[in-house]
Amino acid sequence: DAHKSEVAHRFKDLGEENFKALVLIAFAQYLQQCPFEDHVKLVNEVTEFAKTCVADESAENCDKSLHTLFGDKLCTVATLRETYGEMADCCAKQEPERNECFLQHKDDNPNLPRLVRPEVDVMCTAFHDNEETFLKKYLYEIARRHPYFYAPELLFFAKRYKAAFTECCQAADKAACLLPKLDELRDEGKASSAKQRLKCASLQKFGERAFKAWAVARLSQRFPKAEFAEVSKLVTDLTKVHTECCHGDLLECADDRADLAKYICENQDSISSKLKECCEKPLLEKSHCIAEVENDEMPADLPSLAADFVESKDVCKNYAEAKDVFLGMFLYEYARRHPDYSVVLLLRLAKTYETTLEKCCAAADPHECYAKVFDEFKPLVEEPQNLIKQNCELFEQLGEYKFQNALLVRYTKKVPQVSTPTLVEVSRNLGKVGSKCCKHPEAKRMPCAEDYLSVVLNQLCVLHEKTPVSDRVTKCCTESLVNRRPCFSALEVDETYVPKEFNAETFTFHADICTLSEKERQIKKQTALVELVKHKPKATKEQLKAVMDDFAAFVEKCCKADDKETCFAEEGKKLVAASQAALGL
């Protein structure tokens, strides 16, 4: 499938609009600090060049790889060294090292201002004045803050963003129409970014085999009627798509994703009965719909797994002939029978099975050795079941905010060295598992909860990797992808931690807290809670709860006061003194 000009090939396949959007996303994900206008200029230059190649594939430089073309373009940015420091050194390298260098400098937590939503009328005016610039700005702002966002999916978000403005800016009550849609896009976007970040971490930190194992398990749950060969083909194609996107090859990724959606829809009879509606949609909606499609019904008469994987005398022979294929078949067969298990649990079971075969197939009596392998699965299955049961009970008792606070205390005591903003962000997200998953029946709880927790803990891992401060976090993040959650669950209070010095400034609050949204006020309180635990890691849950209630009483009192700022100053000192006296801070 060689083309004389790769850039011309992708331009023709994708069309000008998608080509420009994807190049903008790629550039914004690499150079996250560059102003919007600079990126637009670069994208326009690349687009004009691509058009010359479409007209004549033999034209000068048209035969160059996309990495070479894009990298050369990025390296023309005048302020590269001032803005990015050592990233500028990437430009001295040749491809493919230069692209690898750019990838290594992607920042999961860039120092960018929070996106503040303007007034609805202001947004609608901007949308009507220049729709194209308005939508490009959306792509740019999301891409630079989420450097691993799944690019073809971001095109889908942009399409929905445009549709929301098109509809709501004509509505009688613009705000009532638009704001819920924007909130939904924001929340879905954050979730989508985090899910994709886990896929990229899986590929980059644990390799293609780890990603393929995850994909086999997930696709087998989703398409239990599909043959193993069909699932294997889908896994290979899906791995290529995500490898490309995670590697910054966004044009190839989007093109291949479209091909995969086309293939799935052309072969839905041998894949899943649930695809019909998805396949009637336009491309971006179709791909999104397929990615989110519900699990198909399991075939009615699936035989016991034991026959082929335990009782058969050929287990070791089959394993030895093609280890990964045999393990893949085991994973496929187990996963299609267990939509009620999380993907990570299925992968733990497959790993246990693999370890057992490695040991037993070298033993004197292999069959005798592996005969009880399925018994080893029981504790692995029960551990997440029990954990989810306990935590859903706690969530139902406390509600989301206080459940988050319980997790904040739990995780701060486990890894107190982690930065307060990271602990707050991660614990708040961990706490959302309650409202997201506890409402589900038993059969859907585990896949919902544990696979969601994998996504959230990956956020902790990528943020911690940027500035490592805890050996325990590093250990849980790097030892095993599928055992990250059990590893963090097993951590007890860090007895080696030396409590943080008391700093009154940390516990100084101002009248601005009164005008914050409920969410922002919660974050302020939760930040104080983390700091409190860091100062007093031995404080009991009851003490922390009581001090937080004092804090709530203090904020409520001062927000009702005539002279709020004076109240915060005077009563704040009293609150700190009272807490110090009670907790011995």
Partner: nanobody, 124 residues
């Protein structure tokens, strides 16, 4: 379950003092803030004072600030309200309450357990 029993109310002259007590039994006492509320005939129940879990921080309604003092003795599971310079408008049934797990610190709905109340009458 928590039982709260108030005592110390009575009939006094304007300008006099009274000391109310509230003895608690049942649920852990020391981990929760305690509140004093009052209800005059035909009026809503209103906040008087909040004494925090350790007795180190007390908030008062503007109408009683400087005259009333709340305190607690966690060893005795008891909370107190010292009322000085009493006025006829302080006449009400006084209730002590244990803080709940949510809601406002200054509203009866934020408190889970209540005593039966003790009458305070201030004559002019």
């Amino acid at each position: 379950q928590v039982q709260l029993v108030e005592s110390g109310g009575g009939l006094v002259q304007a300008g006099d003092s009274l000391r109310l007590s509230c003895a608690a039994s049942g649920r852990t006492f020391s981990g929760y803030a305690m509140g004093w509320f009052r209800q005059a005939p035909g009026k809503e129940r209103e906040f008087v004072a909040r004494i925090n879990w350790s007795g180190t921080l007390t908030y008062y309604a503007d109408s009683v600030k400087g005259r009333f003092t709340g305190s607690r003795d966690n060893a005795k599971n008891t909370v107190y309200l010292q009322m000085n310079s009493l006025k006829p408008e302080d006449t009400a049934v006084y209730y002590c309450a244990q803080r709940g797990d949510s809601g406002s610190n200054y509203d009866p709905s934020g408190y889970s357990y209540w005593g039966q109340g003790t009458q305070v009458t201030v004559s002019s």
